[in-house]
Structures are given as C-alpha cells and as structure tokens.
Interface confidence: low
Amino acid sequence: AVDLTLLANLRLTDPQRFFLTCVSGEAGAGRGSDAWGPPLLLEKDDRIVRTPPGPPLRLARNGSHQVTLRGFSKPSDLVGVFSCVGGAGARRTRVIYVHNSPGAHLLPDKVTHTVNKGDTAVLSARVHKEKQTDVIWKSNGSYFYTLDWHEAQDGRFLLQLPNVQPPSSGIYSATYLEASPLGSAFFRLIVRGCGAGRWGPGCTKECPGCLHGGVCHDHDGECVCPPGFTGTRCEQACREGRFGQSCQEQCPGISGCRGLTFCLPDPYGCSCGSGWRGSQCQEACAPGHFGADCRLQCQCQNGGTCDRFSGCVCPSGWHGVHCEKSDRIPQILNMASELEFNLETMPRINCAAAGNPFPVRGSIELRKPDGTVLLSTKAIVEPEKTTAEFEVPRLVLADSGFWECRVSTSGGQDSRRFKVNVKVPPVPLAAPRLLTKQSRQLVVSPLVSFSGDGPISTVRLHYRPQDSTMDWSTIVVDPSENVTLMNLRPKTGYSVRVQLSRPGEGGEGAWGPPTLMTTDCPEPLLQPWLEGWHVEGTDRLRVSWSLPLVPGPLVGDGFLLRLWDGTRGQERRENVSSPQARTALLTGLTPGTHYQLDVQLYHCTLLGPASPPAHVLLPPSGPPAPRHLHAQALSDSEIQLTWKHPEALPGPISKYVVEVQVAGGAGDPLWIDVDRPEETSTIIRGLNASTRYLFRMRASIQGLGDWSNTVEESTLGNGLQAEGPVQESRAAEEGLDQ
C-alpha cells in the first residue's frame, strides 16, 4: 500500500487551531512536475457533505512530502469529508477523513467501519441531542432508509446492512428529519473486495495474518498497519510518537500523538494513534490495553509489562506477543513441507528462524537438491524471529526435489527439509472447437487437450479477424463452460487460439495452435408486401409495408426500398436500418415522375426477395402556366394585365406571381403576388411614364408553376417619375367597364 497518512488535529475548542496534514513516505512523493509525478493534493470534498461557503482554506506545503490545510474559521467549516491524494501512476491513492460535529444531534459510535465482502455492517448513531422526529439514513448523499424516532435502542439508531458488497462502500449519514445536515452523524463504510482473510482478483489468496489491528489489502495482500506499527504483518511497534510504514514520521507537538486522528489508505480507514482512544483521541489507554484506539489487549505472561504503545515488554529470557516464548537454540519456524512453483520462474523463498543469540541474515542458508547453496538477499528482523528471503535463480525441471533451510548460530543449529515441485505451464495441443455460429457471434468450446501440468486455473481465448494485423482481442473464460465471442463482423473469418494457465506466478502457458472460424449470415427468406403509399408533396412519398408472420426470430438487419425512374434510367435506394420498421418517408424525389417501387429485407450483405412492385406517379412540381396573358396601358403610370386560369389544375391555386421588368433594363425583375387566386385581372401602378415594360406570370399550388408567355407594354405620355410599381387587383370585367 502507498505510505500516505492524513492527520487531523482534533483540538476543537478553537476551529482556527484545527488543521489537517497529509504526509507521504513515498520516495519522491509530492514533488510536483518533476519525474516523480503529481503532487500531494489535500482538499475538502463537498460532493456529499456540503457546508456553507466561507473564506477559502489555506494550503501550505512543507517540503516535498507534506501538505497542511488551515484557515477554518467556524466549527461548521470542519464538518464533512476531506481527502488527500498521493502516489504516482497506478499507485495513486486517496485517503479520506470524515469529520463529525461534536455538537451534532447524532454522533457515530464508530466513524470508520471496515468490513469484508458478504459481512453484515451495523452503523450505530448515538443520540446526543434528542429530537422527536424520524431519522433519515443516507448513502453517499442519497436517501437510503428511514427510522421512526421511537425506534432508538438504548439511545442509538441502528442501520443494519446485510451481505454488503464493495459498491456499498461510501459515506453514510443519519440525520433527524428537518434538522441541519451539519447535525448529522457521518460514517465511512469500507467494504473489502473479498471475504475475511482473502485477497486477490478471485479472492483466492490467503492474507498474511495482519497483527495489531492491521487490515489486509484486498488487491495486493499487504497489511495496512495501524499508526505506530510496522513490518509486513504489522508485527513490530514503532517508538512512542512515531508513525508511517517505516516509523519514519514523528507526531508534532510536545504531547506526541495525543488529539490526532490518523487516516490511512483503504481498507484501514481512520483511528487514533497508538496508545490513544476516545472521540477526540485525547484519552490514554486503560491499563492492559494498547495500540490504535486501545483496541488491543496485552495479556502479558512471565512477568511481562504492558506498554500502551507497543504491547508486552518481556523480561530477559522471554519473547513473543505475550512473553509466552522462551529464548532457545535456533529453530526453523513454520516451514511448509511442500512448495510448488512454475517452470522458468524466479520465486522468492522465505525461511524464518528464532533463537538466542538471535539469527542474523548470514546465519540462514538455503540448499538446492544439486547441493548449490543460496545466501539470502534480504532479512526481515522481527521481535520473535528473523525471516531470510532467498531469490531463486530461474527454475528448471531438475530443481524438483528436496531443498533444505539451515540456520547456524553460536547457540547451535537447525535445519528443515521441504519438497519443491517444479510444474510445467500447460500448452494446448489442439485448437478450440466451433460449436455454433451466427452472423455476429461464435460459440466455442475452449477446453482442449494440453501438455504440461494442471490444474487449469484460467483459459484465455485470443481472437482477431483473419489476416488482420490489429491487436488480438482476449476473453478470460471458465474452463468448464462454452464461451460466446460477441460483437463480431458477419461473413468474416476469425483466427482463434487458446492459452491455458495454471495457478501461481508464471503459470501462463504458450498459445495453442490457431483455427479459422467464420461468422455466418443466413439469407433472409421473408418477402415483404407493400401495403400502401401516400403522396405527401410533389417530392415526398410515405410508404408502408408488412411481413408475413412466422415463428422464431426475424432474420434481418433492415429494409431496402428501391425506386426505379424508367424515364431517366435512374435507381434510388433508401436504407431503413431497423428490422422492426414498417414505414418510411422518401423525400427529395423528382416531381411529376413515374416510379416503380419495391422493398426487400436485408441481412448483413444479403438481400431477401423483393416485394411485388408498386407504380407511383408523383404530381408535377406546380400548376401549368396561366393562359392568354395580355397587357394594356391605362395611363402614364398604370398598366392592366388580364389572363385566363391554367387548364388541368391538380388542385386549387393559392396565388399568382407577376414578374415586372423594364425592357432592356439591367436590374433585377420585381415579383408581385396576386393573393386573390380567383382574379383574372390586375392593375400594376406606380410605373414610369413613356417606359416599355415586360410582364409574365405563373400560378402556385403547393409549388410554383410554369411561367406564362411574356408580354410587352408601354405607359402613356410624359409624366412625373413614379415611386415604383404597385398592383391592384379587380375582376377583369369590372376593370374593362371602367
């Protein structure tokens, strides 16, 4: 685990003296943009517990591995969640501290709850200031549960969370209804990803047995040690007032770690420092108790005395957690009688010994079956034993056999033989077998005969399109079950290979031989039927169709609509990409065109039988031209136009449009609407005197129709310059009478 500690100073009489410090013991931690990566971050997390805005908090960096947050002005500033982030890359870790108001209505009996997957967690909120209203429990800020006020048991409200899973982790709160959220009891629930004593991806590995309240990390199996303890199993106590993974940090102030809460990476959570307890970590342990939160009991034997920071202090001649062990001639401890490793791995083998005088690194050696003696590369010295670690050279099959660990001191010697089995990772002898295929998936039996040693712990199926240079896709499967490769391309060949693994480091075998498996694409057999079509405009057509009802799933990806314009020799194709669709709107068609229309089901690239064709005639784009357009000058500024309605109209005319242009003029023509379509005459006014004009017109129904013939006419005599043409409509007969 990352060596990261968040310290909260709990002297709460004066908020301005409150501070949070994040300390990293990681090499190069917090050095900003240099090669060691991102800096330490320390901040208040307002996502779940929001407090009223106040002056910004002050962040001070003390060297490369420490950052402190100050500037709290009032008690409400303290309530909520604070987090420190440290470590680089994959080791980036967030440590969380939850602060409760000492004056809250409800207080947590215990803030941090670390439980194992599948356990029952019980959160207990103690009534501090009673209110006769319901208690609302929330999880990560969202409503979770309600308890009636009369459900308090011994002055506590309990929330039971049976069979907890990792997603249940987070911030829980208990609040009286209609009370300030700042008066809530806030809890932190940490759910390890494995059951008790287990760790690893499948929770198959056994935890080392963390001592002194250490918690086994569910990802890497390391013990996260309480503040004040160190060692791979937290077996060693630090000196009073020290913390950090190597006891390298010192509590600030003359009173040591008194009044400080320590928060460590999950799954540990938070606690007082070693030797202290209470909600503000200001109470020393009672006699006979020691460790973080004083949770541990000494139970010293043989004249040992209890130290509240380190536990039993043994008299000469005795050792052990409870001073229960006599010093003795050297002895090999807890050596497994049989070990198993995979071929070509370089395992580490540990050999532990105790005795008086105490064994040191050079006094423990390891002997291979061929007589080669290995010396330890590292030794972990603990109060009751020395553990020598041996880095074994790359294993060969000849290394199978009896090995021996030997310890020698001036007090004597001891040895222990144990058997090493070197196993060969499994290699498939055959390719996987194809069971069934569909257009986008293959069902494969991955279990094949293999050379090498079992048991098979993991089967990996590697696959990619044939002749492809892209990366292999990999799926990890259960050895005993068939596997479905999904989201494949239809009608495509895939190269598929099996890789087998056996338990232990280096247990992955070489890939087996490849085989070619091709996805299917059955031809769609259903023939659609055109049910109807509806002209929605001169260039828009709505089409509907049906499919015969047959049992079983519909084989098809969608529909293809085809329109054949025989006059122009052009085909238009429209793809409807849903096999559930039964209607489509075709737009952008050519008005006045005769189309032949059909529809067919498609699957992958295969087309099913086409429907019987339909013949559709779209209306022309607009009405025919008005007939017999005639222009007659009425004065020096007016010309009257008369016409006859177009013939064979497809619908009622909505308006006429008149185009007016000065003959030989270079400017744009002027268009004038005649909005009374029943008219057959209009007077264009505001023209210039003695000027020759060109006129033409067209009708509009849904679209503008064809232009009429162009007519010329000149205004009369010399008059004043007019402002510009305008139009006045009237019935043709009335205009002529005048």
Partner: antibody, heavy 119, light 107 residues
Framework: EVQLLESGGGLVQPGGSLRLSCAAS????????MFWVRQAPGKGLEWVSV????????SYADSVKGRFTISRDNSKNTLYLQMNSLRAEDTAVYYC????????????WGQGTLVTVSS | DIQMTQSPATLSLSPGERATLSCRAS??????LGWYQQKHGQAPRLLIY???NRATGIPARFSGSGSGTDFTLTISSLEPEDFAVYYC?????????FGGGTKVEIK
C-alpha cells in the same frame, strides 16, 4: 446461517409459571432488538414483547403487561420470556424473532414452542 | 391501538393466476408496513418490508405497494408453493399489530 431455537414450552395449570428460552446463532446477537410473537391455535399472529440490543429497554402488549418479563443474556446469545400468572388465553405457539434493522421487520423467526395453559 | 384489517379472508385461485391481497390500517402508518407468509405448521417468513421492499431471497413475483392506510401485496403468477396464509404488520406505533391474515388456497 441465522438460527433461533425456542425451548421451555409445555403444559401448565392456570396461575402457573413458565420460562421460555431462545438460543441464537449465526449473527451478532448483541446488535439487534429481539421479539416474542405468539399465535393461538387456529388464530393470527400477536406481538408479545420486544427488548433492545443491550436489554436496557423493553415493551409489552397490554394483554401480558405485569405478568410477562422479557430479558436477554448477550454473553450466552440467549433471549428469555418469564411468564407468570398464566391464563387459558395465553395458550399459543410462542415464536422468538430477530429484527431486520431498528424495528423495521422481523426477518428471522424460530420454529416456535407450544405453551398450553389448562387445568 | 392501530387495527389492521385484511381482505379477503380467503382467496381461491389456481396456479399461474395473479393474487391481490389487501391490508387496511385504522389510521395512517405511512410506509411502515411488512408482509409475512406462513405455511401450515411453519414459522412466518418475511416477504416485504416498508411497504414495497422485497426481503433477501424473496422471488420477484412478490411485490408490495401502498402508503398511509391502504396497502396491497401482489403475487404476479401463483406457484404451487405460494398457497399459504399472508399477514400484514405495522411498525408505525406501539403496540405492533398484525392483520387477521388472508388465506390463499387452491381453487
């Protein structure tokens, strides 16, 4: 696996006494309220009594108040019901039950013990 | 005391049919209501708590609804093992009270 096992039932004369026990296992007994519920032959369920996790609070149905006493021994994971001044209408199967959370609902029940009050 | 009234007293149905059981409180119990199933000679089993939440291990065919005074337990499609007596129970006020029960029997 949660288990609740009642014992101590039997035949008793009106005015007599009996002490029922309920041995609990498979859960943290000291964390939950515990209940006694009874069921007269051929009748429905009737709540009798409840006790808080520490044993500091108790409550009784009016029909048994002053005659029955509920208690628990968390060190032995055992719930008790001391029944005095028994009447014919106390004849029933007595179930002990564990609460889900607070007093929310009774998620585990014992198989019951029959108490018969008759002369 | 809050009286809990269940109806009907008996419901005769065939396997596969939908069962709808009703429970009415003499005053509002908000959503603080549970449903239990009891088979002959056995202890009751918690089905639904707080009106609509299924207890651990209860099949999805059981569902609860309602708030205030009117509550419903629905069994969407009766299985042979569902023929039993069903009780509702309120936890809104002391004393805790149960309904008189609805017997679901095979037609």
């Amino acid at each position: 696996e949660v288990q609740l096992l009642e014992s101590g039932g039997g035949l008793v004369q009106p005015g007599g006494s009996l002490r029922l026990s309920c041995a609990a296992s498979g859960f943290t007994f000291s964390a939950y309220p515990m209940f006694w519920v009874r069921q007269a032959p051929g009748k429905g369920l009737e709540w009798v009594s409840v006790i808080s996790p520490s044993g500091g609070q108790t409550s009784y149905a009016d029909s048994v108040k002053g005659r029955f006493t509920i208690s628990r021994d968390n060190s032995k994971n055992t719930l008790y019901l001391q029944m005095n001044s028994l009447r014919a209408e106390d004849t029933a199967v007595y179930y002990c039950a564990k609460s889900f959370s607070g007093l929310a609902a009774l998620d585990f029940w014992g198989q019951g013990t029959l108490v018969t009050v008759s002369s | 005391d809050i009286q809990m009234t269940q109806s009907p007293a008996t419901l005769s149905l065939s396997p596969g049919e939908r069962a709808t059981l009703s429970c009415r409180a003499s005053q509002s119990v908000r959503t603080y209501l549970g449903w239990y199933q009891q088979k002959h000679g056995q202890a009751p089993r918690l089905l639904i708590y707080d009106a609509s939440n299924r207890a651990t291990g209860i099949p999805a065919r059981f569902s609860g609804s309602g708030s205030g005074t009117d509550f419903t337990l629905t069994i969407s499609s009766l299985e042979p093992e569902d023929f039993a007596v069903y009780y509702c129970q309120q936890r809104s006020n002391w004393p805790l009270t149960f309904g008189g029960g609805t017997k679901v029997e095979i037609k």
